[in-house]
Every structure is written in C-alpha cells, then in structure tokens.
C-alpha cells in the first residue's frame, strides 16, 4: 500500500529573466527513492538517479541546474516556461509518486515581489 505523500514548493509566480527553485519532498513512507524525474508537460527536464546521479536533458542544459537536493533550479525564465511541472518519485517497493507545481512567468512589471525570485 502506498502511504507516502508528496509536498511541493506550491505554485509559483515569477519574473521573466529570473530564477526559481522547484522542490518536492516525499514523506510518510519508508520506501527507498531510486530515481526522481522532473518533467514539464510531456518533456523530460532532468533525472536524479540514486546510483548514477543527475542527468539534464540536452535541450535544457543551459537553463536548468540540479538541486538543491532533489529539487531543480530553472534560470533565465521566459514567458514560455509558464506551465505545470511534475516531480516523479520512483520508489521501492511503493511505486511511483507524483507532485505537481504550476509556474506562471510574467513580465517584470507584473510579477509580485520579483526580487524574491532571484537565486542568490
């Protein structure tokens, strides 16, 4: 039985040109995390494998950085990055857990507290 739950950063509104961190955390289970996939729509952004480490998809190499932890940092945001992002936890013996985060990227004058979305 799958007892775990995924907690996420929550939905985010960010500035065009800025950076944000997407994070998920799996709790309430003793299952072993074997791999975490980060996806947007049907595109694979990155994989963090327990044995092999990180793999960033070639098309996102310039703008996606691994971490912190099992999270993902998106840089140089564009309006086209607006959309839903999925963290997919592959675990043993539970199976797959999925978290969802919606990111809205807005022109600089619109996003709330824009400076807070910059990664130091």
């Amino acid at each position: 039985m799958m007892t775990g739950t995924i907690e996420t950063t929550g939905n985010i509104s960010a500035e065009k040109g800025g950076s944000i961190i997407l994070q998920c955390h799996l709790s309430s289970t003793t299952a072993q995390v074997t791999q975490v996939n980060w996806e947007q729509q049907d595109q694979l952004l990155a994989i963090c494998n327990a044995d092999l480490g990180w793999h960033i998809s070639p098309s996102f190499k310039d703008r996606v950085a691994p971490g912190p932890g099992l999270g993902l940092t998106l840089q140089s945001l564009t309006v086209n990055d607006t959309g839903e992002y999925f963290c997919i936890y592959h675990t043993y013996p539970d199976g797959t857990y999925t978290g969802r985060i919606f990111l809205e990227v807005l022109e600089s004058s619109v996003a709330e507290h824009g400076a807070r979305f910059q990664i130091p």
Epitope: T9, N11, I12, I20, V110, E112
Partner: antibody, heavy 119, light 112 residues
Framework: EVQLQQSGPELVKPGASMKISCKAS????????MNWVKQSHGKNLEWIGL????????SYNQKFKGKATLTVDKSSSTAYMELLSLTSEDSAVYYC????????????WGQGTSVTVSS | DVVVTQTPLSLPVSFGDQVSISCRSS???????????LSWYLHKPGQSPQLLIY???NRFSGVPDRFSGSGSGTDFTLKISTIKPEDLGMYYC?????????FGGGTKLEIK
Amino acid sequence: EVQLQQSGPELVKPGASMKISCKASGYSFTGYIMNWVKQSHGKNLEWIGLIIPYNGGTSYNQKFKGKATLTVDKSSSTAYMELLSLTSEDSAVYYCTRGLQRFYAMDYWGQGTSVTVSS
Amino acid sequence: DVVVTQTPLSLPVSFGDQVSISCRSSQSLANSYGNTYLSWYLHKPGQSPQLLIYGISNRFSGVPDRFSGSGSGTDFTLKISTIKPEDLGMYYCLQGTHQPPTFGGGTKLEIK
C-alpha cells in the same frame, strides 16, 4: 471592459460529447490563463483545468482527465472545453474564468453554460 | 488534494450585522517563497461568481471596503462589516497554492 461570453445551454444524450466555447474580449487573450470550473447542484465548485493561451499548455484536475479537453483559438480569442462520453453526473453549469496574474485567483467569470445530460 | 473547509454552512443575518466566514485548509497555503494564494468569491442568485478578495487580504477593484480578508497558513477569515441586501448569496474561498486548486464548500448568507 473584460468580458467572457460563453455558448448557450445544451441538452445532450448520454454517451455523446459536446464543446462549450468562451469568447474573450477587452484584454490581451494570450496574456492570461483561462480556467474552467464546474458547478454541480447549484452549489459545489470544482476546478476542471486550465489552458495557457500563449503556448497551449494545459493542466487538469486528475478527476477530469479524459472527461474534459481544453483548447484555444488565438485568432478569435476563444477558449473551448470539450466534454466527452457524457453521463448524468456531468449535468452542471460550467464556467470559464480568467486567471488573475500572480495571485492564482479568478478575476472574471463567463455567464456559465448549463449542460443537461438526459435521454 | 488540499481539502478546504468553510464554516458555517449557513449564516442567517440581519441587515447592518457584522459577520465572519472561516476557511481552513488541510495544509499550509504559503508557498516556498512566502506567497499565499487564497481568494474569496460571492455568488449571487442568477449571476456568475465574482471575485471579492485575492492574496488573503487584497480587495478586487470595485469591491466595497466593508469586505476584508485576513489569515495565514491554514486559517483564513472573510469579514463583512455592515451587511447590505446586495451581500446575500453564497460565499466561497479558493486555494490556488497547490495543484489542483480547490474551493471551500460554500457559506450561504441569508436573511434571518
């Protein structure tokens, strides 16, 4: 003035599919997310999903995946929701709503489209 | 999904009364950047729902200042300071922090 004009009421047979339209005016259509909301029994509100007119991206409530399909026509500033394989459970009023930028709220609502599924 | 619970279900009032409606969520509505996406709506009979309050406490344009929102974390309140006839209807809160967005069950504001 921001307006969301929805198509008229529908009476459809069980098993059929149908499409509701939502024509936006008074603002830049591609600059705002469009949500769809179901109201059952004149009370409960449920978020069905959203579409990003700018890039066509979608996000669905898992409960409505396979039931609703969201699309847009940028040239006419119109959003569409197709409802598939209708049953009596789908009888409701459906609203399109504009997403309020940066606050994940819904600032403007269409007038609603009443859908009745009956043989 | 985040469960949003509204109380009371029904609120009988007299014109001129001050009332409060509570909205509680099953998990915190503050995202990792400290923003909380909680909004309030009024649905009057025969009309579409209308936005009253967004981001916990911001009044939407044209909304009278007798409406105010407050709260944090999992506990939120809508206050109406002096009830008028046009305030009658169903009130809903909506959390937009977690996917999917979820509405409260509604509070019916009706005359005593």
